[in-house]
Interface confidence: low
């Protein structure tokens, strides 16, 4: 009696279970009663990443430099090419089809994590005792100046955007 279901890595065709092609290979002809499934390797610019019965391999993704993209990892017969963005840019989505500039951290924020080709700058608010007075993609929050260590006193309190202002101690005789 013909099977109604096949084992893992097989497929049902003409009332018969045939082996799927392994990753990196495409289907040339289905198996018969007398022959095995015939598969052929994908060419250099192509891939298939699963056990399959595809008659065509997929083209590797093209990382178009005109779009700010560059190759992060070259594709193989079993994996697609992975693109990333050029310096100063990062991907808008996981599939990395387009790039946008890294954002800066505004005054009052410092860089928690510098951007990469695939992720944007992560900013964090400067906590009490720290400040940032610049819009920067690299600078962390800086600690307020310690007036005491310079034998000075605080004349103006610091904020998340400004440093403290130190001044001489009033020496009243």
């Amino acid at each position: 009696e013909p099977p109604t279901a096949c084992r893992e890595k097989q497929y049902l065709i003409n009332s018969q279970c045939c082996s799927l092609c392994q990753p990196g290979q495409k289907l040339v002809s289905d198996c018969t009663e007398f022959t095995e499934t015939e598969c052929l390797p994908c060419s250099e610019s192509e891939f298939l990443d699963t056990w399959n019965r595809e008659t065509r391999c997929h083209q590797h993704k093209y990382c178009d430099p005109n779009l700010g993209l560059q190759v992060q990892q070259k594709g193989t017969s079993e994996t697609d090419t992975i693109c990333t963005c050029e310096e100063g840019l990062h991907c808008t989505s996981e599939s990395c089809e387009s790039c946008v500039p890294h954002r800066s951290c505004l005054p009052g924020f410092g860089v928690k994590q510098i951007a990469t080709g695939v992720s944007d700058t992560i900013c964090e608010p400067c906590p009490v005792g720290f400040f940032s007075n610049v819009s920067s993609a690299f600078e962390k929050c800086r600690p307020w100046t310690s007036c005491e260590t310079k034998d000075l006193v605080v004349q103006q309190a610091g904020t998340n955007k400004t440093d403290v202002v130190c001044g001489p101690q009033d020496r009243q005789r």
């Epitope: 779009l67 500039p101 954002r103 800066s104």
Partner: antibody, heavy 118, light 107 residues
């Protein structure tokens, strides 16, 4: 002074393709990021996507299967195509410029109403 | 997507009043928020960018501030030309998202 001007048909039939063009003066579409945003009847504003100085595009996930943004650098224009439209695509469509994070979206077109109706 | 919750959705006020509109972001947006104004004619004008920077040509009665993920637009003394719709826009991450809008009407 940077100016953006939307143009295109004001009435589109359901299932057809909506096509709009934004003509830019005072700046080049070969620099910055050029965006489409729409305002539905009522108050809801929706971001649609951009085409960048390099020609790369970003489409909001909910529209990705229907939207195409392209540009014509010789005419200094960028365009929106939205396929298989329904009444839910009736909106005022705006084009807008984005250059720097510190500046946000700094120039907007005046908007054009597109009605989807048979 | 980042959700922007704007309140109130509508309010009425008189010329000279001080008015405050707020937007809350569902995630940290690092200050990348704009306030925009839409007049009845339909034209959109940017008022504030980067949470608190006044856009060029915008009167100083408009100001923006931020506390954590809550952002505020304040109009210190309402003028007749200020009656319009106001929206916040986060442009920190894609897709950009807008608040639901505030309709500011004359009392």
């Amino acid at each position: 002074e940077v100016q953006l001007q939307e143009s295109g048909p004001g009435l589109v039939k359901p299932s057809q393709t909506l096509s709009l063009t934004c003509t830019v003066s005072g700046d080049s579409v070969s620099s910055g990021y050029w965006n489409w945003i729409r305002k539905h009847p009522g108050k809801k504003l929706e971001y649609m996507g951009f085409i960048s100085y390099s020609g790369s595009t970003y489409y909001t996930p909910s529209l990705k299967s229907r939207i195409t943004i392209s540009r014509d650098t010789s005419k200094n224009q960028f365009s929106l195509k939205l396929s298989s439209v329904t009444a839910a695509d009736t909106a005022v469509y705006f084009c807008a410029r984005f250059r720097r994070y510190d500046d946000g979206v700094d120039y907007w077109g005046q908007g054009t109403l597109v009605t989807v109706s048979s | 997507d980042i959700q922007m919750t704007q309140s109130p959705s509508a309010m009425s006020a008189s010329v000279g009043d001080r008015v405050t509109i707020t937007c809350r972001a569902s995630h940290e947006i690092s200050g990348y928020l704009s306030w925009i104004q839409q007049k009845p004619g339909g034209t959109i004008k940017r008022l504030i960018n980067a949470a608190s920077t006044l856009a060029s040509g915008v009167p100083s009665r408009f100001s923006g501030s931020r506390s954590g993920t809550e952002f505020t637009l304040t109009i210190s003394s309402l003028q007749p030309e200020d009656f319009a719709d106001y929206y916040c826009l986060q442009y920190s991450s894609y897709p950009w998202t807008f608040g639901g809008g505030t309709k500011l009407e004359i009392k």
